[in-house]
């Protein structure tokens, strides 16, 4: 339904609060370096208008695209070219071009200061102050960071993160009351920019088709009662929410999503038993609740798939009539009885019917070429689950720290080109699997592990795409979605890496790292154990763990000196020497 | 018991719709493809069409587009829904249960006893 | 469309006779045997007695059995009981599903 001014109807669509917030997270999403006054400045102007569109639509500019209107606004930014470089150059473009030039331009790892947390005292003396600006720069604060953060999704961390602060800093005791919450929100936070990011890639690298496969596959798991006819109306949808979103347009994504969640609800007695509780939650917690719910339970009484798939004499006159149709059916069976698949699992699964099909429906005896194709599922199956199991005996072996260090040793002699914060980062996260998947019965590890590992090892992907310096890596990333994680487990010590060369001043450590908070000690460590690994990529475990437990304990016996300079200096002179000996560099 | 009773028949004007109905009991119906197959008075019996567990449908070149199967599992019952009916659809109609399960082998097992329409003004 | 024609249409015989029903497709059936027999009487829905050209249903007497492949099949009573007066048809699955089609039924009377 065309509308005569797509700002006004957005506008009046989301409410004020929510289009000012929306417009915010756009303009920080594209232009991520921007001081927040400016940004707030834009949104102001933008916001006026728009009223000045619901007021009349056929006023002025009004009938513009919101590309158009919100392309114009950033490209008036005086510093532009300063601040951003070849940026700027997007702004000679028409549209649609300028947007795809923004968006190419969205920094993942953008060079902005870490957000280091006030006290509580002062956080909670800016919240009274001024509440409005207190969670403006909230979400400006997070969507500079995270340029593909699910811009609904960020609305409703927004109105968590108020809760927290209306509810703790009346409490007797306001830092035990805020600071778990902010934690959790902030684990949170990051876990959900991560799993958007991955859907973005999706998407972005590998199509619309990809993008369906995945969210047939999944909602077939979270939705086994509901009709292949729904299941497909809800992927249509879906995927045309986070095409909007992927793409920066914001204000339509939120509008869609909202209108989802409705549907959803609507027609929850077709979809899930398991929605009843979400449905009765305002619309933020509504979304949000939809999109963690829980699966529901398989239908009693489901067919065997092998008649339909195999055994019938009619697949290939089904496959050829409409192919994709036909695998989304044979995915959405496949899928909803198997909600102890992974996602890539199951998607694994469909491309091998799909390349059996393509290659036996040209053959003599179709059906005879293609009986045994369940069988050729089984290696496929067996890969992931002794892969979890063998690295969840390890984790349970280890505990989080040592296992996140097992995965540094392991990453680092497979791609030692990769730079050692991203090493430390991707490892650190994928060490995470353990204590996030191996505490759940067999039937939920795979999908929680599997899942997991593609939205972490997407992390590495995207990091790794705006510096390439493995081919291996942009081989594992490019080459197959789906098959990232087993290219990247399959991958052995790189023979060709020159061992980096020995530079002193990369273990030379100082006392402040005895005032640092555990994760960030730990991380130090884990940073000396990547630079080791480029030094020396042929040490063996046993060398590593000493010189780690030497590093550990120089660490403990230098924080616990009267004079922990000095003792830095010193002692970890001799334990450079030592290690130097211990690895034989 | 192990059968299949159909339901839905009786007089409909031409042009009308009607849906029949075929429910079984003494077993799944999600195991074995459901045929729907008509005989017109004093003649030979003519093959409708077919649903398949999976619910994939295949329907004989003259009921295509008029004629629609569908299956409702958790009622254990199949549907032949009918439109544009003519006189000649006069028939009794029976539901039946095949030996294989994702296609039609022709070999239907089990039959319902059918149930009249007759298509007349 | 596929045809399958049933011959004789129409045939007499007595308790005890040899029997025996031709049915002809226009296609080969799919794999070479995908062909079933049905006996029905009045006022009763058909009943299986042969699947896939030659195997017998459950439950029904070894004096019937089916032969052939590809397009021409047979049924065949081997001793007639009284029981078995009644009409004939065959039906054969093709390489689609929509292609399942019945014979025109051959109607076998007393003498």
């Known amino acids: 339904d065309a509308h005569k001014s797509e700002v006004a109807h957005r506008f009046k669509d989301l409410g004020e609060e929510n289009f000012k917030a929306l417009v915010l997270i756009a303009f920080a999403q594209y232009l991520q370096q921007c001081p927040f006054e400016d940004h707030v400045k834009l949104v102001n102007e933008v916001t006026e208008f728009a009223k000045t569109c619901v007021a009349d639509e056929s006023a002025e500019n009004c009938d513009k695209s919101l590309h158009t209107l919100f392309g114009d606004k950033l490209c008036t930014v005086a510093t532009l070219r300063e601040t951003y470089g070849e940026m700027a150059d997007c702004c000679a473009k028409q549209e649609p071009e300028r947007n795809e030039c923004f968006l190419q331009h969205k920094d993942d790892n953008p060079n902005l200061p870490r957000l280091v947390r006030p006290e509580v005292d002062v956080m909670c003396t800016a919240f009274h102050d001024n509440e409005e600006t207190f969670l403006k720069k909230y979400l400006y604060e997070i969507a500079r960071r995270h340029p593909y953060f699910y811009a609904p999704e960020l609305l409703f961390f927004a109105k968590r993160y108020k809760a927290a602060f209306t509810e703790c800093c009346q409490a007797a005791d306001k830092a035990a009351c805020l600071l778990p919450k902010l934690d959790e929100l902030r684990d949170e936070g990051k876990a959900s920019s991560a799993k958007q990011r991955l859907k973005c890639a999706s998407l972005q690298k590998f199509g619309e088709r990809a993008f369906k496969a995945w969210a047939v596959a999944r909602l077939s798991q979270r939705f086994p009662k509901a009709e292949f006819a729904e299941v497909s109306k809800l992927v249509t949808d879906l995927t045309k929410v986070h095409t909007e979103c992927c793409h920066g347009d914001l204000l339509e994504c939120a509008d869609d999503r909202a209108d989802l969640a409705k549907y959803i609800c609507e027609n929850q007695d077709s979809i899930s038993s398991k929605l009843k509780e979400c449905c009765e939650k305002p619309l933020l917690e509504k979304s949000h609740c939809i999109a963690e719910v829980e699966n529901d339970e398989m239908p009693a009484d489901l067919p065997s798939l092998a008649a339909d798939f195999v055994e019938s004499k009619d697949v290939c006159k089904n496959y050829a009539e409409a192919k994709d149709v036909f695998l989304g059916m044979f995915l959405y069976e496949y899928a909803r009885r198997h909600p102890d698949y992974s996602v890539v699992l199951l998607l694994r699964l469909a491309k091998t019917y799909e390349t059996t099909l393509e290659k036996c429906c040209a053959a003599a005896d179709p059906h005879e070429c293609y009986a045994k194709v369940f069988d050729e599922f089984k290696p496929l199956v067996e890969e992931p689950q002794n892969l979890i199991k063998q690295n969840c005996e390890l984790f349970e072996q280890l505990g989080e720290y040592k296992f996140q260090n097992a995965l540094l040793v392991r990453y680092t002699k497979k791609v030692p080109q990769v730079s050692t914060p991203t090493l430390v980062e991707v490892s650190r996260n994928l060490g995470k699997v353990g204590s996030k998947c191996c505490k759940h019965p067999e039937a939920k590890r795979m999908p929680c592990a599997e899942d997991y590992l593609s939205v972490v090892l997407n992390q590495l992907c995207v990091l790794h795409e705006k510096t390439p310096v493995s081919d291996r890596v942009t081989k594992c990333c490019t080459e197959s979605l789906v098959n990232r994680r087993p290219c990247f487990s399959a991958l052995e010590v790189d023979e060709t890496y020159v061992p980096k060369e020995f530079n002193a001043e990369t273990f030379t450590f100082h006392a402040d790292i005895c005032t640092l908070s555990e994760k960030e000690r730990q991380i130090k460590k884990q940073t000396a154990l990547v630079e080791l690994v480029k030094h020396k990529p042929k040490a063996t475990k046993e060398q590593l763990k000493a010189v780690m437990d030497d590093f550990a304990a120089f660490v403990e016996k230098c924080c616990k000196a009267d004079d922990k300079e000095t003792c830095f200096a010193e002692e970890g002179k001799k334990l450079v020497a030592a290690s130097q000996a211990a690895l034989g560099l | 018991e192990v059968q299949l009773v159909e339901s839905g028949g009786g007089l409909v004007q031409p042009g009308g719709s009607l849906r029949l109905s075929c429910a079984a009991s003494?077993?799944?119906?999600?195991?074995?493809?459901m045929g729907w197959v008509r005989q017109a008075p004093g003649k030979g019996l003519e093959y409708i069409g077919i649903?398949?567990?999976?619910?994939?449908?295949y329907y004989a070149s003259w009921a295509k587009g008029r004629f629609t199967i569908s299956r409702d599992n958790s009622k254990n019952t199949v549907y032949l829904q009918m439109n544009s009916l003519r006189a000649e659809d006069t028939a009794t109609y029976f539901c039946?249960?095949?030996?294989?399960?994702?296609?039609?082998?022709?070999?239907?097992?089990?039959w319902g006893q059918g149930t009249l329409v007759t298509v007349s003004s | 469309d596929i045809q399958m024609t049933q011959s004789p249409s129409s045939l007499s015989a007595s308790v005890g006779d040899r029997v025996t029903i031709t049915c002809q497709s226009s296609?080969?059936?799919?794999?070479?045997?995908?062909l079933s027999w049905y006996q029905q009487k009045p006022g009763q829905p058909p009943k299986l007695l042969i699947y896939?050209?030659?195997d017998l249903a459950s439950g029904v007497p070894s004096r019937f059995s089916g032969s052939g492949s590809g397009t021409d099949f047979t049924l065949t009573i081997s001793s007639l009981q009284p029981e078995d007066f009644a009409t004939y048809y065959c039906?054969?699955?093709?390489?689609?599903?929509?292609?399942?089609?019945f014979g025109g039924g051959t109607k076998l009377t007393v003498k």
């Open positions: 039946a249960r095949d030996r294989h399960g994702g296609d039609s082998s022709g070999a239907f097992y089990l």
């Open positions: 039906a054969g699955g093709f390489s689609s599903s929509s292609d399942t089609a």
């Open positions: 003494g077993f799944s119906l999600s195991s074995n493809a």
């Open positions: 649903i398949s567990v999976g619910g994939f449908t």
């Open positions: 896939d050209a030659s």
């Open positions: 296609e080969s059936v799919y794999s070479n045997n995908q």
